[in-house]
Amino acid sequence: LIIGFGISGKHFITVTTFTSAGNIGEDGTLSCTFEPDIKLNGIVIQWLKEGIKGLVHEFKEGKDDLSQQHEMFRGRTAVFADQVVVGNASLRLKNVQLTDAGTYTCYIRTSKGKGNANLEYKTGAFSMPEINVDYNASSESLRCEAPRWFPQPTVAWASQVDQGANFSEVSNTSFELNSENVTMKVVSVLYNVTINNTYSCMIENDIAKATGDIKVTDSEVKRRSQLQLLNSG
């Protein structure tokens, strides 16, 4: 969370950004809020990126102005125009690429004053893991798969019954490059699992942490997955 202040004569407004992460090949959002101003035509929003000449995006007088937009962002950005009057200057980014990572500045000018705040945008790939019982194995085993990760993550197993146990000796993890030659599919197999236990497969890189849980009993298999972006707030 970054809060910036700006001074315009005697006036300053608070601009707030949130460190966020983009999943390559998908839509991303660069979050920025400011003190609302009901006079839409008096609001100017400028998004800038460190190291890039020209603007990422500009919105003024109630509409987009792309006359100074850098070519790498052409056709890839939009503000949430209907939410600008309530103080939302967040930017929607199409087809996030690794090269979109960096420091962005959200600059705001309204009839109340002006202000800006920086935002650190990380890019990579992250996805939910799915755990299944591998009945093909000679002994009962679990297979944890997640289709897209970058940079290469670490994978660890845990169990409710054997808390603190190290499963690295009884698991095997592989990383398979996907067709676009950037992201990788993560596959981890845990051997010699026991019934009536809950196992967790944890995948983590510097952008995200994902956990898949599976509870295997005689009568049913229960699964749960969650994904958490790191350093977002």
């Epitope: 390559i24 090949g25 998908e26 839509d27 995006h57 509409k63 987009d64 102005d65 792309l66 006359s67 937009q69 052409r74 056709g75 890839r76 950005t77 939009a78 125009a81 929607r92 199409k94 087809n95 897209r148 996907n178 067709s179 676009e180 992201t183």
Partner: antibody, heavy 121, light 107 residues
Framework: EVQLVQSGAEVKKPGASVKVSCKAS????????IGWVRQAPGQGLEWIGD????????NYNEKFKGRVTITRDTSTSTAYLELSSLRSEDTAVYYC??????????????WGQGTLVTVSS | DIQMTQSPSSLSASVGDRVTITCKAS??????VAWYQQKPGKAPKLLIY???TLQPGVPSRFSGSGSGRDYTLTISSLQPEDFATYYC?????????FGQGTKVEIK
Amino acid sequence: EVQLVQSGAEVKKPGASVKVSCKASGYTFTSYWIGWVRQAPGQGLEWIGDIYPGGGYTNYNEKFKGRVTITRDTSTSTAYLELSSLRSEDTAVYYCARLAGSSYRGAMDSWGQGTLVTVSS
Amino acid sequence: DIQMTQSPSSLSASVGDRVTITCKASQGFNKYVAWYQQKPGKAPKLLIYYTSTLQPGVPSRFSGSGSGRDYTLTISSLQPEDFATYYCLQYGDLLYAFGQGTKVEIK
């Protein structure tokens, strides 16, 4: 309500040029990309290119580069497709379409009625 | 440039059938795949965008899925008004590209 109204059918001779218009209403013309797509008789859809009326920025299918020009007139909220050096295989229905997402180039969500261009000697 | 290979080119089905149409992208990964329905003499109609988001007003029997290079349009229970030609569109790249189309006919 978003509406795209295209100009009428055209018959042209090989080697000539054609200019098709697409008049937009029901939204802020300068805020949304407009694309052009064609469909030859009994064939599939083929993307030609698009324009951002707010700045005049264009993207073109490599297949048509050098022969196609997409322009706009913001005073009349009209986009134009001009295709030169016409040949018989350019005979098709030409559609204009608005791209969703305003300055973000999205999928084509509203379409014109189509303009039949016939190239015949 | 990303090309989209659509299959099958045509299929015959009955009312109530489940129908699946696929598109394969020539490269890369992005979720920017849309699906259109077109009837003879009419402009295409947007059904689904961003792989799986249903366009407002489109019946819920239409659904989209996919990841990586493979994308699918499913009609869960074919209705009489669904007999038409369907196209996928890749719109994540700078240059857009349609699939060749799939004609859904009455068996």
